[in-house]
């Protein structure tokens, strides 16, 4: 069978101060199993942006229902976006284990900020 | 209409081995992880082992002697049991994983189960 | 180790009458709890997932409550059909996934 491969759709998305920036990512698998978590920026000092067990995300939403079976769509939406948020996304799967481990990673979509329009 | 028929189950000896099967049917059986539970005479579910693509993970009271496999091209899913022990008599149901949403794995779909007495 | 306590262990109660059930999580579990029903010699069915949410085909008066580590099923008006064995699981953190012991609900 295919492995399962992480799709984030879009290279870049443009987004004026101060309104939501939706980040697109899809699995095309349910399995291996363990969870989904989002990151801005690539290596070690990468910032965890969305993570749905532990930490608070006040301006992370997720974009589908939270009741949704099956779901393999991880597409998130970041609110009230400011010039500090922009960098690349990376949507990545882990696979579950003590401690999980990283399994694979979208190609990242890159944010950019557009000064708010007066 | 899913599907799930446990077999391989019966009396064996502490010490012995047995190998469950559990064929599935009525839905795409690659796409999802599969689980073993077990329930001993008159006492509550224990979950035994659960299996995804390559990753397999173990209740500590299994772990070094079931072995958890699955072969997609058969819609089978297998519990090779080991140094089999008299606390591991019960009956053994295989169960379909479900998700929702973000989070982790519950079993919409079990099996009749098969029973399995380690006795001497 | 997220250990599930089901209280009472035993309900005794009269066809019609509401019948409730609960699940307490040694720690947080957010929504990630299900609830099963098993008959005499038969497997589990599961009757409700996230906490709150009915399986298809689940009658409506089975419903789910709770989040964090308080959860409860309520059966509003329990059926012959409806004396069974119910077990509450979380699947927050896992491996393992845990059960609870168990509430059997019996004929008054």
């Known amino acids: 069978e295919e492995e399962l491969q992480v799709i984030q759709p879009d290279k870049s998305v443009s987004v004026a101060a101060g309104e939501s920036a939706i980040l697109h990512c899809t699995v095309t698998s349910l399995i291996p199993v363990g969870p989904i978590q989002w990151f801005r920026g690539a290596g070690p000092a990468r910032e965890l942006i969305y993570n749905q067990k532990e930490g608070h995300f006040p301006r992370v939403t997720t974009v589908s229902e939270s009741t949704k079976r099956e779901n393999m769509d991880f597409s998130i939406s970041i609110s009230n976006i400011t010039p500090a948020d922009a960098g690349t996304y990376y949507c990545v799967k882990f696979r579950k284990g003590s401690p999980d481990t990283e399994f694979k990673s979208g190609a990242g979509t890159e944010l950019s900020v557009r000064a708010k329009p007066s | 209409e899913v599907q799930l028929l446990e077999s391989g189950g019966g009396v064996v000896q502490p010490g012995g081995s047995l190998r469950l099967s559990c064929a599935a049917s009525?839905?795409?059986?690659?796409?999802?992880?599969m689980t073993w539970v077990r329930q001993a005479p008159g006492e509550g579910l224990e979950w035994v082992s659960t299996?995804?693509?390559?990753?397999?993970y173990y209740a500590d009271s299994v772990k070094g002697r079931f072995t958890i496999s699955r072969d997609n091209s058969k819609n089978t899913l297998y519990l090779q049991m080991n140094s089999l022990r008299a606390e591991d008599t019960a009956v053994y149901y295989c169960?379909?994983?479900?998700?929702?949403?973000?989070?982790?794995?519950?079993?919409?779909?079990w099996g009749l189960g098969t029973l399995v007495t380690v006795s001497s | 180790e997220i250990v599930l306590t089901q209280s009472p262990a035993t309900l005794s109660v009269s066809p019609g009458e509401r019948a409730t059930l609960s699940c307490r999580a040694s720690q947080n579990v957010k929504n990630d709890l299900a609830w099963y029903q098993q008959k005499p010699g038969q497997a589990p069915r599961l009757l409700i997932y996230a906490a709150r949410i009915r399986e298809t085909g689940i009658p409506a008066r089975f419903s789910g409550s709770g989040s964090g580590t308080e959860f409860t099923l309520t059966i509003s008006s329990l059926q012959s059909e409806d004396f069974a064995v119910y077990y509450c699981q979380q699947y927050y953190d896992w491996p393992p996934f845990t059960f609870g012991g168990g509430t059997k609900v019996e004929i008054k």
């Open positions: 299996i995804g693509s390559g990753d397999t």
């Open positions: 169960a379909k994983d479900s998700t929702v949403s973000w989070s982790g794995d519950f079993f919409d779909y």
């Open positions: 009525g839905f795409s059986f690659s796409n999802f992880a």
